[in-house]
Amino acid sequence: KSPIFGPEEVNSVEGNSVSITCYYPPTSVNRHTRKYWCRQGARGGCITLISSEGYVSSKYAGRANLTNFPENGTFVVNIAQLSQDDSGRYKCGLGINSRGLSFDVSLEVSQGPGLLNDTKVYTVDLGRTVTINCPFKTENAQKRKSLYKQIGLYPVLVIDSSGYVNPNYTGRIRLDIQGTGQLLFSVVINQLRLSDAGQYLCQAGDDSNSNKKNADLQVLKPEPELVYEDLRGSVTFHCALGPEVANVAKFLCRQSSGENCDVVVNTLGKRAPAFEGRILLNPQDKDGSFSVVITGLRKEDAGRYLCGAHSDGQLQEGSPIQAWQLFVNEESTIPRSPTVVKGVAGGSVAVLCPYNRKESKSIKYWCLWEGAQNGRCPLLVDSEGWVKAQYEGRLSLLEEPGNGTFTVILNQLTSRDAGFYWCLTNGDTLWRTTVEIKIIEGEPNLKVPGNVTAVLGETLKVPCHFPCKFSSYEKYWCKWNNTGCQALPSQDEGPSKAFVNCDENSRLVSLTLNLVTRADEGWYWCGVKQGHFYGETAAVYVAVEERKAAGSRDVSLAKADAAPDEKVLDSGFREIENKAIQDPRLFAEEKAVADTRDQADGSRASVDSGSSEEQGGSSR
């Protein structure tokens, strides 16, 4: 007995499409072996029509596909534009056609529903609008116009020109009579329901001379589009519902048991808690289309999603909808990385961001997710040397360790830095990941002075105290700029006295600036790393002033100036439109705008954006 299972009989009508799902035991071998769909011949052979290895018969060209879902142990054969010639006996199977791992499927394609003579067929999607046109002759121009629906054997009045409207259609139907020149009336039904489907009769006049026209209304429930994405990756649902609902509230919901559809996000500001920090509803285009991006996909995100439009911002009968069935592949190509990173006030975090290693030359970005309205993610830093003004001196994006991972370092943390951040590139949009930064109680591990003032032409020594827990780490000083942090020579001055309960393994490492010049002004970081993996950092701002009295300056922790007040957000902050995040091709345009703004406010002045090789040092 074959372990493959599927539908024994499939029935459809000409012009329609079918989705045939075949189930197989999801063993490792089965998941990766060839899947096929073949037609059984009279003499017992089975001719392949489509396979998972890319073969498509000329009979199926442009109208069929085969999708394997290894995680679920299923594969789906979609066949469109059916004709009666497609009727026959088929097999869906694994491996080689002649072997026994297959299931017999009978497909019968019939001519379609028998319709009355002169019947106009209207095929419309659920939730949309249909206009049924009803011609009449001059003698009935002044007579009553009506539309009936055939319920069983009886016609039931739906609407007429005297003002009657059947209660089932209240608020969503109208009867329009064209100008005197045109012998036509039309009935417009909005927010179509599945129950609206059926045979209709429109009539002008009520006597034996009345004009009648038959109409067959077919209301289609949308076929869910199959979407298969990797665990920890991201998915984008593009929703195009048409211009007629451009000004109606939009939503994305996920079907739970039964017919409930729980709102995931809508344009009225609702968002499901499970998606906090990892969802964006991109602004609508003029035609009413929008898209929803979900990152950090979890196993439990799998399911059926509907997008739609309704004034309530949730699924109601008659909402126009689009549907997707999301499968989340647990055999993910996206590596595990921490989803929560903790730091202390005044301290730092180093976040590892995965990217598709095939796209090492792509531009890397880091943005801060904001939940207001439909969510947005303004960029904070990129790998091309742009840093948002408010983050200068405390944020750096490093290409290291490379080979599929980049690093983002944020220091001088405050409680306001808590939140969700997205790692993304202008390459593979599926590799968007989310990390939550949490600010916890505690003291920074590295101790440095606050602001330091150096004197032109003199020598400055700045200390950094490393506790013994970092004894095995490489310790460094570097000078921060937009493109990273260039390593500087530093001196190990032996054990530090800044830590209680810390033995000889603690360290005081100093940065020495000889013959200070104006160019030495700026942010300096001390930090720890292991190979290409970065740990904690601490930042010091060095100001340079004219000489007052001779001598060199040796800064201690006690002498340090108070930390500067935190900079407040100004109105010129840079934000990538959500659309740009969803479609990296838009980055280039946005970047150009941002660059001119950066130059205008001076934040790019004197930045040498040389290659990482030229910059050398431990941080680039």
């Epitope: 459809s12 329609n16 499409s17 299923t74 039964g258 017919e259």
Partner: nanobody
Framework: QVQLVESGGGLVQPGGSLRLSCAAS????????MGWFRQAPGKEREFVTA??????????YYADSVKGRFTISRDNARNTVYLQMNSLKPEDTAVYYC?????????????????WGQGTLVTVSS
């Protein structure tokens, strides 16, 4: 909510026939699959047959044990699914349950259907 009511069960001799009906009411427009399961005394509930539909296409599934003997069909207008059982055997004796599922994608053989009827007893005995 969806309500399912089975009928047509009873006593029949081996080799005889029986037709079960399952009438659905409530929010039936969201149903994508209806199936029949059975549970014999002291045994686990098992899949018998199912019918799935999407647009004007339908898909019929059968357990190996009933292939060629049982036929599932659907009357769209009446929101009813039928199970025609021919060549009945004593081992077909069980309580037959009708079930409805909203998803087009779940394996129809699994018992994780969204709605269930109360069941109707079929006894095959001479």
């Amino acid at each position: 909510q969806v309500q399912l009511v089975e009928s047509g069960g009873g006593l029949v001799q081996p080799g005889g026939s029986l037709r079960l009906s399952c009438a659905a009411s409530g929010r039936t427009s969201s149903i994508s699959t209806m199936g029949w399961f059975r549970q014999a005394p002291g045994k686990e509930r098992e899949f018998v047959t199912a019918i799935r539909w999407s647009g004007s296409s339908s898909y019929k599934y059968y357990a190996d044990s009933v292939k060629g003997r049982f036929t599932i069909s659907r009357d769209n207008a009446r929101n009813t699914v039928y199970l025609q059982m021919n060549s009945l055997k004593p081992e077909d004796t069980a309580v037959y349950y009708c079930a409805a599922q909203m998803s087009l994608w779940r394996d129809p053989r699994e018992i994780d259907y969204d709605y269930w009827g109360q069941g109707t007893l079929v006894t095959v005995s001479s």
